[in-house]
């Protein structure tokens, strides 16, 4: 093995390099010194490094490592952040249009219901948006609330428009009757199934993307340990102490050091792989009733069908509701 | 069937986008994302190698630094000697991940569990969802024709499913991404604190 070239007799090269790292030359020895106080770049002979320089090298090494890590994840981070934003906005657009479709259906088919229907539809789709963004709302409750709110209006405006004002305190009964009489048939259940499935999947999809960002951010901003800092310093900077400015670390040595420094980070690998494969599986299943775009944009039609169902059974319903929502049966049996 | 509310979009931008020839649905966008993400599936296991390849490492030189001395690039000492009597690498590995990494691993485990439970079971015929989820016998009254059958997924083929192109604030064209593979920064553009 060839002997190392003799260190720069005046430490001049080392000084000029170090000046770029740390303006102010007072830390670099004029000439090589024994370096007995060094803890990382342990000298085999005279050295151009001081304890202060060593500390600066360690700091720089850890900083380099952090920057390398950030540049490594830049494209991945960009990909996920960008997509999370795109999908969130796209989902909001879908919700907005689904609301517009539904309002338009009411305006064109049931103009007498519109003022109140618009309000209930608006509240429903607001809840849909909040649910997608992670709000603690129950989808079945949202759908029930929509139909509970719509039915009294349908009953008083479409089925029984001549109802005297004195009878209008039956709204609460009508809300209850809506469920007990299964006024809308099985449409509410159908909508619950489709909306809850599609929204759950949409919500978990967004949650997963946001967690992806969190994972990258976490590993992006890792602070490396002192031990790692020492290993990196030895690999990248200790050669300078001997005046070996142009020498680069051995490849195998670099891999060993990096595996040591990144042992913790690499533990994420198994779960990261599983994350991507699980996300792929989820995405592959996001169609038909698991696709919120398909479900929400078709809601107006299902709601329309449900109102037609009520109208079809209006005669029988009106009779039953007349009994159930009477303040007392005894009025009828006197 | 319900009057289709095509002319009543409050957001006029949709009308502009709705008939674009090379339409892009949300589902195709999702699949595209997954394909891109899959190219990063080995991201974490490849990190050590990636960082070595993006920091100064002897490639064409005969001699390299092993942490203690100059050695020939292919000698055993190239990897081994530098570690001797210095730091116990095994100990460093044994310390286990930092608390923040452990936390993020726990979160990943949790989301993976959720993703698995939410995934549609393979082989499930979704076309039959009305039979599975829909009108139960007895719910439609005695007269069977009270049951409305036209409300399943079949009817949900909305004429123009939402397309989102120009109206999205973000454009995910590959050209916008800084590099289209995992090499985020070119090698000759090393981080400024390396002075080689």
């Amino acid at each position: 093995q060839p002997p190392p070239p003799p260190p720069d007799a005046t430490c001049h090269q080392v000084r000029s390099f170090f000046q770029r790292l740390q303006p102010g030359l007072k830390w670099v020895p004029e000439t090589p010194v024994p370096g007995s106080d060094l803890q990382v770049c342990l000298p085999k002979g005279p050295t151009c490094c001081s304890r202060k320089m060593e500390e600066k090298y360690q700091l720089t090494a850890r900083l380099n490592m952090e920057q390398l890590l950030q540049s490594a994840s830049m494209e991945l981070k960009f990909l996920i952040i960008q997509n999370a934003a795109v999908f969130q906005e796209a989902f909001e657009i879908v919700v907005r249009h689904a609301k517009n479709y539904t309002n338009a259906m009411f305006k064109n088919n049931y103009p007498s219901l519109t003022p109140q229907a618009f309000e209930f539809v608006g509240e429903f789709f607001t809840d849909v948006s909040l649910y997608i963004l992670g709000s603690d709302i129950n989808v079945d409750d949202m759908v029930n609330e929509l139909f509970d709110s719509l039915f009294p209006v349908i009953y008083t405006q479409l089925m029984n428009p001549g109802l005297p004002d004195s009878a209008l305190d039956i709204n609460e009964c009508l809300r209850g009757a809506r469920r007990d009489l299964k006024v809308f048939g099985n449409f509410p259940k159908l909508i619950m199934t489709q909306v809850s499935k599609s929204l759950q999947v949409t919500r978990i999809f967004l949650q997963a993307l946001n967690l992806g960002i969190e994972v990258i951010n976490t590993t992006d901003h890792l602070k490396f340990s002192k031990d790692c800092g020492r290993m990196l310093t030895r690999m990248w900077y200790c050669s300078y102490c001997q005046g070996l400015m142009m020498v680069k670390p051995c490849g195998g040595y670099c891999n060993v050091v990096m595996q040591g420094c990144m042992a913790g980070v690499v533990e994420i690998d198994k779960y990261w792989r599983e994350y991507i494969l699980s996300l792929e599986e989820l995405v592959n299943g996001m169609y038909r009733i698991y696709d919120m775009e398909n479900v929400l944009l078709g809601l107006f039609s299902t709601i329309h069908d449900s109102i037609q169902y009520v109208q079809k059974n209006a005669g029988k319903l009106t009779t039953t509701i007349g009994k159930l929502c009477a303040h007392s049966q005894q009025r009828q049996y006197r | 069937s319900a009057y289709y509310p095509e002319d009543l979009f409050i957001d006029k931008k949709v009308l502009k986008v709705a008939h674009v020839e090379h339409e892009e649905t949300l589902s195709s966008r999702r699949r595209e994302l997954i394909q891109k993400l899959k190219s990063f599936i080995s991201f974490y296991s490849a990190l050590p190698g990636y960082i070595c390849s993006h920091s100064p490492v002897a490639e064409n030189d005969t001699l390299c630094w092993n942490g203690q001395e100059l050695v020939e690039r292919y000698s055993q000492k190239a990897a081994r000697n530098g570690m001797k009597n210095q730091f116990n690498l095994h100990e460093l590995k044994m310390k286990g991940p930092e608390p923040v990494v452990s936390q993020i691993i726990d979160k990943l485990k949790h989301i993976n569990q959720l993703l698995r439970t939410m995934s549609v079971p393979k082989g499930r015929v979704l076309d039959k969802n009305l039979d599975e989820e829909g009108f139960e016998s007895g719910d439609c009254g005695d007269d069977e024709d009270e049951c409305i059958g036209g409300s399943g997924d079949g009817m949900m083929k909305v004429k123009n499913q939402l397309r989102f192109l120009a109206e999205l604030a973000y454009d995910l064209d590959v050209d916008d991404v800084p590099g289209n593979n995992q090499q985020a920064t070119p090698k000759d553009n090393e981080i400024s604190t390396f002075h080689n």
Partner: antibody, heavy 117, light 108 residues
Framework: QVQLKQSGAELVRPGASVKLSCKAS????????INWVKQRPGQGLEWIAR????????YYNEKFKGKATLTAEKSSSTAYMQFSSLTSEDSAVYFC??????????WGQGTSVTVSS | QIVLTQSPAIMSASLGERVTMTCTAS???????LHWYQQKPGSSPKLWIY???NLASGVPARFSGSGSGTSYSLTISSMEAEDAATYYC?????????FGGGTKLEIK
């Protein structure tokens, strides 16, 4: 005229179950709610649950969930309440009452349940 | 749950006397859902006054009911022997539906 006829008195062992019946006549059974109310000796009234026989929808007092199960048989215009895991606390008279959305108008004569070993 | 408190728990009145009993709810109850039942020993309760002020079928006109919000009352303008019984107020508004503890009316 509206009548609710309840099954006869029951003497049951602790831990056992009992199924009480309430047969309705004089009105359309599926059009009104059937409620069940408990009255312990010398005490007040306590609402247990109600069922809408037309759809089978049930509503329970949280206190009796898991204890009482309501069913209705349209063909015989009969409502049932199954009471399970009986203890001495369940010794009481149980009434069925038919109601609109607002009012319990008509009551059965009551069924006395005695839980004793 | 809505707690209904009846007072007095027991009262006695002479024949021909005016009688008033009250029912106080722990939170507001709509008058449409506040009712009174009469129960005599060994019998089932009978609907007596419904929706605060309406007399059930067969109830004598000497009975009346009033109130709103959290305060309701049942009044007998002139006590008669057949009126001796326990009277329960009841809210059928918010589940769990509840009854007051009862006012036992005796003849003095």
């Amino acid at each position: 005229q509206v009548q609710l006829k309840q099954s006869g008195a029951e003497l049951v062992r602790p831990g056992a179950s009992v199924k009480l019946s309430c047969k309705a006549s004089g009105y359309t059974f599926t059009d009104y709610y059937i409620n069940w109310v408990k009255q312990r000796p010398g005490q007040g009234l306590e609402w247990i649950a109600r069922i809408y026989p037309g759809s089978g929808n049930t509503y329970y007092n949280e206190k009796f969930k898991g204890k009482a199960t309501l069913t209705a048989e349209k063909s015989s215009s009969t409502a049932y309440m199954q009471f399970s895991s009986l203890t001495s606390e369940d010794s009481a008279v149980y009434f069925c009452a038919c109601s609109t959305y607002y009012t319990m108008d008509y009551w059965g004569q009551g069924t006395s349940v005695t839980v004793s070993s | 749950q809505i707690v209904l408190t009846q007072s007095p728990a027991i009262m006695s009145a002479s024949l021909g006397e005016r009688v008033t009993m009250t029912c106080t709810a722990s939170s507001g109850v709509s008058s449409s859902y506040l009712h009174w039942y009469q129960q005599k020993p060994g019998s089932s309760p009978k609907l007596w006054i419904y929706t605060t002020s309406n007399l059930a079928s067969g109830v004598p006109a000497r009975f009346s009911g009033s109130g709103s919000g959290t305060s309701y009352s049942l009044t007998i303008s002139s006590m008669e022997a057949e009126d001796a019984a326990t009277y329960y107020c009841h809210q059928y508004h918010r589940s769990p539906y509840t009854f007051g503890g009862g006012t036992k009316l005796e003849i003095k």
